[in-house]
């Protein structure tokens, strides 16, 4: 098809070589086609204009994306040729950064239902550049965490080094939907809820004497529980003595509850105290037996093939630790009578 009638948009993606980041292109079909086609229509059925230039299908996947090869070859279907580019509804997701993503991307509806629809297409000229060292060293991350229940903010990575006063007007999207109220380089969230999680896109315009570009960055926002302020607690064993039968095998379980930590390196181990000596026991690997948003319950067992008289003089100690501190629980074995 002839792409000369497509509306054109220029975008710039400046990626950091230090971090993994994604990028998106929206199929910004000219209004009102886009609103009808990509389910962004804010009109009620009674308010639909008499004539829509593009009467597209309501199936959101019915947008076709192409890349225009720089050598003038025919357009290539994105889905067939580029495994690192994912189409989701009207959005194209680039999973990996790199200058090889530079090029012209065209989107248009698959179903052409009227003569008006032929020109219903958008050509996006994407330029991809690595961030230079001269750029801001402390730019905001493309992965940002918001602490549930507290105040937080989402910063536009490409503008995070500028003060609010000197920052240009920013257009924000969340999961592909325009956040019309937000215009600054930072979104302030008064109280963080689960629904604040998602893919945020920030755009601003950069112009030179010749042309203007939309500078775009993508931020993956995650809502998280705050790191625990508590050391782990041992749920089992509860008692410090355990009745056993001599000569019989024995398994003692240590179960500990660890609170949420972003960087999670739990320690759970068994050691034996015998008079002045103390040594760690080689036991089966620890296992998580319950995992919730707030805590992880981890179990580690000590296995004795048969209980001996010597074991009755020893103390079996379970030691658990997180970044806050440690807890121990010791068990003394006692021979069962009768």
């Amino acid at each position: 098809f002839n792409i000369s009638g497509c509306s054109t948009k220029k975008l710039l993606w400046t990626y950091s070589t230090r971090s993994e980041e994604e990028f998106v292109l929206f199929c910004d079909l000219p209004e009102p086609q886009k609103s009808h086609f990509c389910h962004r229509n804010r009109l009620s059925p009674k308010q639909v204009p008499e004539h829509l230039p593009f009467m597209g299908s309501n199936d959101l996947s019915d947008v076709q994306w192409y890349q225009q090869p720089s050598n003038g070859d025919p357009l290539e279907d994105i889905r067939k040729s580029y495994p690192h580019i994912i189409q989701d509804k009207c959005t194209l997701h680039f999973l990996t950064p790199g200058v090889n993503n530079s090029g012209s991307y065209i989107c248009r509806p698959k179903m052409i239902k009227s003569p008006y629809d032929v020109a219903c297409c958008v050509k996006m000229i994407l330029e991809v550049k690595p961030q230079t060292n001269a750029s801001c060293e402390y730019s905001a991350s493309h992965k940002q965490d918001l602490l549930l229940g507290s105040t937080g903010s989402i910063s536009c990575p490409s503008l995070s080094c500028q003060s609010d006063a000197q920052s240009p007007a920013v257009t924000w999207y969340k999961n592909g939907k325009l956040l019309s109220v937000e215009r600054s380089n930072r979104i302030v969230v008064d109280e963080v809820y689960d629904y604040h999680q998602g893919t945020y896109v920030c755009d601003y315009t950069q112009s030179d004497t010749v042309s203007s570009w939309t500078v775009r960055a993508v931020v993956q926002v995650r809502t998280i529980v705050g790191d625990t302020k508590l050391k782990p607690d041992i749920l089992d064993p509860v008692e410090d003595t355990l009745e056993v039968e001599l000569g019989k095998p024995l398994t003692i379980s240590c179960k500990a509850r660890f609170g949420f930590e972003r960087v999670f390196n739990p320690v759970i181990k068994w050691y034996i105290k015998d008079s002045d000596l103390e040594w760690e026991v080689s036991v089966p690997e620890a296992k998580s037996i319950k995992s919730t948003l707030k805590d992880e319950i981890i179990e580690r067992n000590i296995i004795l093939e048969k209980v001996t008289q010597r074991d009755l003089r020893r103390k079996f100690v379970c030691f658990v630790q997180n970044s806050i501190g440690n807890t121990t629980q010791s068990v003394q074995l006692k021979e069962k009578r009768g």
Partner: nanobody, 117 residues
Framework: EVQLVESGGGLVQPGGSLRLSCAAS????????MGWFRQAPGKERERVAS????????TYADSVKGRFTISQDNSKNTLYLQMNSLRPEDTAVYYC??????????WGQGTLVTVSS
């Protein structure tokens, strides 16, 4: 640092087999669940299979039942996905993931599986 590294992807003909491996390092315990996910071009990421480390029980997506098998070798800290009777629609990037604090939070970088004649 906790890390998952997938391997074993590649180009295979329809009806062929592949075995994916995921090497886990940095974990001080065995997560409650481990899983394999995939993301095909133009589609969202989907869970293919998962395994419970406590019970050893497994769950599979309907599209792979009877063809794929998930297993783990805790002594080698490795998760596997045996894929048989592969179809063109199985073409995707396959990711290994570990469950932590109520969600699959730790992810590998992925390995590409292409099923084509």
């Amino acid at each position: 640092e906790v890390q998952l590294v997938e391997s074993g992807g590649g180009l295979v003909q329809p009806g062929g087999s592949l075995r994916l491996s995921c090497a886990a390092s940095g974990f001080t315990y065995i997560p409650a669940y481990m899983g394999w996910f995939r993301q095909a071009p133009g589609k969202e990421r989907e869970r293919v299979a998962s395994i419970s480390s406590t019970e050893g029980s497994t769950t599979y997506a309907d599209s792979v039942k009877g063809r794929f098998t998930i297993s783990q070798d805790n002594s080698k800290n490795t998760l596997y996905l045996q894929m048989n009777s592969l179809r063109p629609e199985d073409t995707a990037v396959y990711y290994c993931a570990a469950y932590q604090f109520g969600a699959f939070r730790v992810w590998g970088q992925g390995t590409l599986v292409t099923v084509s004649s």
